[in-house]
């Protein structure tokens, strides 16, 4: 299911990098979140629960990431103009069932003031 544009601030700039915020419902217990740049998978994070509610976090394509109870943040560093693109949060929900996939995204604009290490 494609949801289209994120209805929240998806990009947060700091120190020449960007935090890309991928939100999900806090009812969701087990999921995979992928960050797509165009159609390419940049990062992913999978959260599963084992017996005794032990939480497991795995990444096949590792990026610096941060997990909360309703979002995954992926961090991109050393921004340059090539980072300008459409970025999508591709959420696959395993628990609660049934399995659902939802895609939200937005365009990352790169302005001179946000670039890393710009010449003064």
């Amino acid at each position: 299911e494609i949801n289209g544009s994120a209805n929240y601030e998806m990009f947060i700039f700091h120190n020449g990098g960007v935090q890309i915020l991928c939100k999900y419902p806090d009812i969701v217990q087990q999921f995979k979140m992928q960050l797509l740049k165009g159609g390419q998978i940049l990062c992913d994070l999978t959260k599963t629960k084992g017996s005794g509610n032990t939480v497991s976090i795995k990444s096949l394509k590792f990026c610096h990431s941060q997990l909360s109870n309703n979002s995954v943040s992926f961090f991109l560093y050393n921004l340059d103009h090539s980072h300008a693109n459409y970025y999508f949060c591709n959420l696959s929900i395993f628990d609660p069932p049934p399995f659902k996939v939802t895609l939200t995204g937005g365009y990352l604009h790169i302005y001179e003031s946000q670039l890393c290490c710009q010449l003064k």
């Epitope: 949801n3 209805n7 939100k23 999900y24 309703n70 929900i93 049934p98 659902k100 939802t102």
Partner: antibody
Framework: EVRLVESGGGLVQPGGSLRLSCAAS????????MHWVRQVTGKGLEWVSA???????YYSDSVKGRFTISREDARNSLYLQMNSLRAGDTAVYYC???????????????????WGQGTTVTVAS | EVVLTQFPATLSLSPGERATLSCRAS??????LAWFQQKPGQAPRLLIY???NRATGIPARFSGSGSGTDFTLTISSLEPEDFAVYYC??????????FGPGTRLEIK
């Protein structure tokens, strides 16, 4: 008018098999998760099995390993293959559908808002 | 498995009276609760989803409330066609999806 029509019920001996079908019309079948719910005469409702829009399947413990749910979206059809039937499987079987929509941080569940009229399965020798 | 308990098992009231039906869950199901009405020989009909949202075509005299573990279905002024069996149902902690045992609403 939204319609679900079940068929395939009947009398079968213990250990036998039946295949139930459910034909849908007038709604977007492939956007619905579909379920089979059964009811013994004079008793309450019991969930049997479900299949998600992605084809993921779920079963109650009482039918796991004996029943198989499937769907054919191109034909707007839902099926329940019932094997190794027991007397305890005797009931009216309803097909029903519900929807879950995820929007950002929101998880919406809209309930089982479409139901068929039911088909009767009797397991007896 | 989430166990749903409904009470009373039977409720005897007259047309025009207010009916209050209760459903209790064995664990927190937030607001993911639905109510159904079933008449003899008919399939169940969805009345309420998300604990408090009326389904399409359901009269305003039906209302739902509650969250967590305690839920209520209220019929503000009973019509003759409202006498039936009412079931609550959860579909957030599953499988299995579970239904309550039902409350029979009968004419006094």
């Amino acid at each position: 008018e939204v319609r679900l029509v079940e068929s395939g019920g009947g009398l079968v001996q213990p250990g036998g098999s039946l295949r139930l079908s459910c034909a849908a019309s007038e709604f977007i079948f492939n956007s619905y998760d579909m379920h089979w719910v059964r009811q013994v005469t004079g008793k309450g409702l019991e969930w049997v099995s479900a299949i998600g829009t992605a084809g993921d399947t779920y079963y109650s413990d009482s039918v796991k390993g004996r029943f198989t749910i499937s769907r054919e979206d191109a034909r707007n059809s839902l099926y329940l293959q019932m094997n190794s039937l027991r007397a305890g499987d005797t009931a009216v079987y309803y097909c029903t559908g519900d929807r879950t929509v995820v929007r950002g941080v929101n998880y919406y569940y809209f309930g089982m808002d479409v139901w068929g009229q039911g088909t009767t399965v009797t397991v007896a020798s | 498995e989430v166990v749903l308990t409904q009470f009373p098992a039977t409720l005897s009231l007259s047309p025009g009276e207010r009916a209050t039906l209760s459903c209790r869950a064995s664990q927190n199901i937030r607001s993911y609760l639905a109510w159904f009405q079933q008449k003899p020989g008919q399939a169940p009909r969805l009345l309420i989803y998300g604990a408090s949202n009326r389904a399409t075509g359901i009269p305003a005299r039906f209302s739902g409330s509650g969250s967590g573990t305690d839920f209520t279905l209220t019929i503000s002024s009973l019509e003759p066609e409202d006498f039936a069996v009412y079931y609550c149902q959860q579909r957030i902690n599953w499988p299995p999806i579970t239904f309550g045992p039902g409350t029979r609403l009968e004419i006094k």
